[in-house]
Amino acid sequence: TQNKALPENVKYGIVLDAGSSHTSLYIYKWPAEKENDTGVVHQVEECRVKGPGISKFVQKVNEIGIYLTDCMERAREVIPRSQHQETPVYLGATAGMRLLRMESEELADRVLDVVERSLSNYPFDFQGARIITGQEEGAYGWITINYLLGKFSQKTRWFSIVPYETNNQETFGALDLGGASTQVTFVPQNQTIESPDNALQFRLYGKDYNVYTHSFLCYGKDQALWQKLAKDIQVSSAESLADPCFHPGYKKVVNVSDLYKTPCTKRFEMTLPFQQFEIQGIGNYQQCHQSILELFNTSYCPYSQCAFNGIFLPPLQGDFGAFSAFYFVMKFLNLTSEKVSQEKVTEMMKKFCAQPWEEIKTSYAGVKEKYLSEYCFSGTYILSLLLQGYHFTADSWEHIHFIGKIQGSDAGWTLGYMLNLTNMIPAEQPLSTPLSHSTYV
């Protein structure tokens, strides 16, 4: 008789990434009998929630339920009904909520309470909503990319699963850029991690890893822009601000109250004789770069070496995967190719920023103007952060790989978070069974 396919013995998991600018829902799937194998979990769906990040719902918490509906309904469709009750749902909130909590624990709690109540209404196994630490965000991002790249697998492969993968088992470093924070995580080479706050020890699949990580709160691309504007207006104190980080001809009115709403601009806060000011773009990469560098305090370092703001950073080691906004921005600018040198990236940024705003709008007619207007700043910020902030050089630039997906799964902290919470990364190397279970009889 003909072989009949048995029902698929698979499991699902859902993670919501509640970021500062938006929320994304990820659905993961894996074979039930291979939970401890490395590389078996893969993403089957990403659903981007329409609207801002959850921290923006402080004044309208009653709208959170509706906000989450579309993506939660999508999860209901994608995951077979028979699996709903055993599918765990986790929500992790990142730097946007860390900043809200810094201002008020009560307001942050209120948002999370409403989020929890909304998610509890679905037929899944809701496991809670929490603000993850910057250290967790960095660590889980590092776990995600190395898991997907097969770096934890003890089996050496003769083939590469992704173009930039080297066949050795050296882990990749992780560079994550969000709207409100940025993380750098990697295994330093025989270097003591001088600051205990930046040290993580993992035992994964029978191997020990001493990992360096730091999350720079307020140095995500959106908060960095607010910082730059607050610094510039503090210096000029004029109602019109000539800004090199925006295209020539670009104009935008900014409310002073919005500028000082975030703890990130606290150090630049001052009483201004006006409630609004106008940004007038002049599109000059070099001046924009110089302005951004003023956000990095490199004059003080209590360690053998630092990134900026007195934060310890060991010498960079190995290859790095740069994902989230590092990837989105560089992809838009068409600068993710391995062949593009740092000098070439800088050259392209100079040209791009100098293009008149009207020309840019015409060239990218399908892109929302709010996002389109900020690519000059964001691209320049990425260069400044990587070169002056993290001390990459023209030579080590080639070790940065701008990654969106690996094997169909998004690079980011969510997969690592789920792998950890579902205990799918064993400390010891699992004993390999002589034969894997077949799904056919």
């Epitope: 402080v58 004044q59 918490v61 860390r98 909590r101 810094m102 201002e103 008020s104 624990e105 009560e106 307001l107 942050a108 709690d109 209120r110 630490t133 910057g134 250290q135 706050d197 709160l217 307020c218 703890p263 990130c264 601009t265 606290k266 150090r267 630049f268 806060e269």
Partner: antibody
């Protein structure tokens, strides 16, 4: 476990300055603001101000502005408060407290005595 | 500045009975659906200890006999049943706006 450890008692002369410290442990130091509170005669509590350890920005009670300075050292996870031009009215216990709007964790206090 | 008026200034309650302390704000301390009102207990030689946050939520490890209520401008702290260990000073505090302010305190004793 969150802990705030404050420096020891101070006996200072009128007109002088005092600088006290508050060392934090058990949490990410830059994720929370640090407030300072004055308590005189074991009864009256007065909020002095707070600092954002993340970037050193601070906000003060107008009553203490210009006379109090708040600073942090993020590598040692320590917040400092300096009070200048002291008078007998400044004799009090001074507390640091972690929080945005919820002062859930307090230091044990630094007792300052201003006396000629 | 928001002025917090606490009453009574002192209170003596029998063991097992109810103690009620009131705190009135000169203007509303509510914002975004949250009451920024807090209650602290302080014993001699110790820092204040958070009992209640957001007007009615119990702080970590706080016994259920401590209850906070109220919104807007009128708040109260109820302790029932009163225990010997509850002898202390009690303060209300608002953090709706800077400068954050405290009530004058209530001294609670055993009758």
């Amino acid at each position: 476990e969150v802990q705030l450890q404050q420096s020891g008692p101070e006996l200072v002369k009128p007109g002088a300055s005092v600088k006290m410290s508050c060392k934090a442990s058990g949490y990410t130091f830059t994720d929370y603001n640090m407030h300072w509170v004055k308590q005189s005669h074991g009864r009256t509590l007065e909020w002095i101000g707070y600092i954002v350890p993340l970037n050193g920005g601070s906000t003060f009670n107008q009553k203490f502005k210009g006379r109090a300075t708040l600073t942090v050292n993020t590598s040692s996870r320590t917040a400092y408060m300096e009070l200048r031009s002291l008078t007998s009215e400044d004799s009090a216990a001074y507390y640091c407290a972690r929080g945005g709007t919820r002062f859930a964790y307090w230091g044990q206090g630094t007792l300052v005595t201003v006396s000629a | 500045d928001i002025v917090l008026t606490q009453s009574p200034a002192s209170l003596a309650v029998s063991l097992g009975q109810r103690a009620t302390i009131s705190c009135r704000a000169s203007e509303s301390v509510d914002n975004f659906g949250v009451s920024f009102m807090y209650w602290f207990q302080q014993k001699p030689g110790q820092p204040p200890n958070l009992l209640i946050y957001g007007a009615s939520n119990q702080g970590s490890g706080v016994p259920a006999r401590f209850r906070g209520s109220g919104s807007g401008t009128d708040f109260s702290l109820n302790i029932h049943p009163m225990e010997a260990d509850d002898t202390a000073m009690y303060f209300c505090q608002q953090t709706k706006e800077v400068p954050y302010t405290f009530g004058g305190g209530t001294k609670l004793e055993i009758k």
